[in-house]
């Protein structure tokens, strides 16, 4: 017979967990003993089953773990794992601090969408990567010309909405342009908005004429000469 002991104490060295609100937290207390010990959890010294917690908790006894998803400020506290068997018991305290993030305008990854050059008839993907605490919505816009002008009397550009979606729908951050033609050339804007405000970045698509397959086949190396 053997009292409980920690099997991976090096994985338990991080005592203080300071986590942004909305993130997932996982506490682990991997242990062993003979007989095999049981694990239970306390929050601030009281038995913790997560029944009062929105979203509940996940206890994975075989992994000696406690998982809380989408943490909120009320989850702050001291979490104790109590591991015991008939021979003895051990405990370990984790401290959880939940950091309240300030919701901000969407942040767009620098350099996206990127300026792109394509050949007539090819397919193009324009990417836009968005970081936002508040759920963002995205629009892909194409800048267009009306009566020979790109701008209205108010000084703002003429734009056409190509695609609108919320970020959680699939492929919302990618604009697919199939079988591009010369008319597809121009400026494209990825616009992301949330309850705080809007952010947008633009890129240019250049469409080159279709290559002559005969010329390409006859002198392929010519494409790489200066």
């Amino acid at each position: 017979q053997q009292a409980p002991y920690w099997t991976h104490p090096q994985r338990m060295e991080k005592k203080l967990h300071a986590v942004p609100a909305g993130n997932t937290v996982k506490f682990r207390c991997p242990a062993a003993g003979n007989p095999t010990p049981t694990i239970r959890w306390l929050k601030d010294g009281q038995a913790f089953h997560g029944e009062n917690r929105i979203g509940g908790i996940r206890l994975r006894h075989q992994h000696w773990s406690l998982v809380m998803e989408s943490v909120v400020p009320s989850d702050r506290g001291t979490y104790t794992c109590l591991v015991e068997n008939a021979v003895g018991s051990i405990r370990y305290n984790y401290l959880l601090d939940v950091l309240e993030r300030s919701p901000h305008r969407p942040i767009l990854q620098a350099g996206l969408p990127a300026n792109t050059t394509a050949v007539v008839g090819s397919d193009v993907e324009l990417l836009c990567k968005v970081y936002s605490d508040a759920q963002p919505h995205i629009q892909w816009l194409k800048h267009i010309v009306i009566n020979g002008s790109s701008f209205g009397a108010d000084g703002f550009p003429y734009v056409q909405v190509l695609k609108t979606a919320d970020i959680n729908s699939s492929e919302v951050e990618v604009l697919y342009l199939r079988n591009v033609s010369a008319e597809d050339a121009g400026e494209y804007t990825c616009l992301a908005g949330n309850s705080i405000g809007l952010s947008y970045q633009s890129a240019w698509l250049t469409v080159l004429p279709e290559e002559d397959p005969t010329w390409t086949a006859a002198a392929p190396e010519a494409r790489y000469t200066d």
């Epitope: 300030s102 919701p103 901000h104 305008r105 942040i107 767009l108 620098a110 508040a134 759920q135 919505h137 629009q139 816009l141 108010d154 703002f156 550009p157 734009v159 909405v161 609108t164 804007t189 616009l191 908005g193 949330n194 309850s195 705080i196 405000g197 809007l198 952010s199 947008y200 970045q201």
Partner: antibody
């Protein structure tokens, strides 16, 4: 004409509740986030809360968190602010303000249109 | 929270003379999209605030060109090139980059 018109203000005792409304007209209300901003007598401006265009996201100033609830009814073009457990320090003019829209910003992306405000006085 | 500090508290200006109001933010208001999200308002007696300048230096529609905004990152200035009697009011700067949105304490402009 783009317009925001607040109502529901009045005199109320500390600890009581009040519900403010803001009627929007002249623009597609359901496409804009909306804010409440307040101003205590003789003081500066303080942001209170925001709600996203579809009502799915709401954020509050720490001073009102847990007491005030912002909501909207897009079918009626109406923004609301439910104020519970009112305190003397909540006494202010409450302004309804248009926030960011969903499309390309032809000008500022919000905080361009303000209502005339409604006065809330919390006093015993 | 981002703190907006405005100076001076009040300003008495002779008509036709210039006026300048400063605003400092505790964090940079330059966003990843290259825009600086500081707004300027004037509030005239008994009225709601009116937008003058957005995104650092853009004049809102209908705002006279004697009003201009400038600055970078954390230091911002609103200038009135030639003050007129109708410019009397309290001027506020505001950061519009993250919640809670915050305002400067205000600068009261009066005519000498």
């Amino acid at each position: 004409e783009v317009q925001l018109l607040e109502s529901g203000g009045g005199v109320v005792q500390p600890g009581r509740s009040l519900r403010l409304s803001c009627a929007a007209s002249g623009f597609t209300f359901s496409s804009y986030a909306m804010h409440w901003v307040r101003q205590a007598p003789g003081k500066g401006l303080e942001w209170v809360a925001v709600i996203s265009y579809d009502g799915s996201n709401k954020y509050y100033a720490d001073s009102v968190k847990g007491r005030f609830t912002i909501s909207r009814d897009n079918s009626k073009n109406t923004l609301s602010l439910q104020m519970n457990s009112l305190r003397v320090e909540d006494t202010a003019i409450y302004y309804c303000v248009r926030g960011a829209g969903r499309g390309f910003p032809y000008g500022p992306d919000g905080f361009d249109i303000w209502g005339q405000g409604t006065m809330v006085t919390v006093s015993s | 929270d981002i703190v907006m500090t405005q100076t001076p508290l009040s300003l008495s200006v002779t008509p036709g003379q210039p006026a300048s109001i400063s605003c400092r933010s505790s964090r940079s208001l330059l966003h990843s999209d290259g825009k600086t999200y500081v707004y300027w308002y004037v509030q005239k007696s008994g009225q709601p605030p009116q937008l003058l300048i957005y995104e650092l230096s853009n004049r809102f529609s209908g705002v006279p060109d004697r009003f201009s905004g400038s600055g970078s990152r954390t230091d911002f200035t609103l200038k009135i090139s030639r003050v007129e009697a109708e410019d009397v009011g309290v001027y506020y700067c505001m950061q519009y980059i993250e919640a809670p949105l915050t305002f400067g304490g205000g600068t009261k402009v009066e005519i000498k």
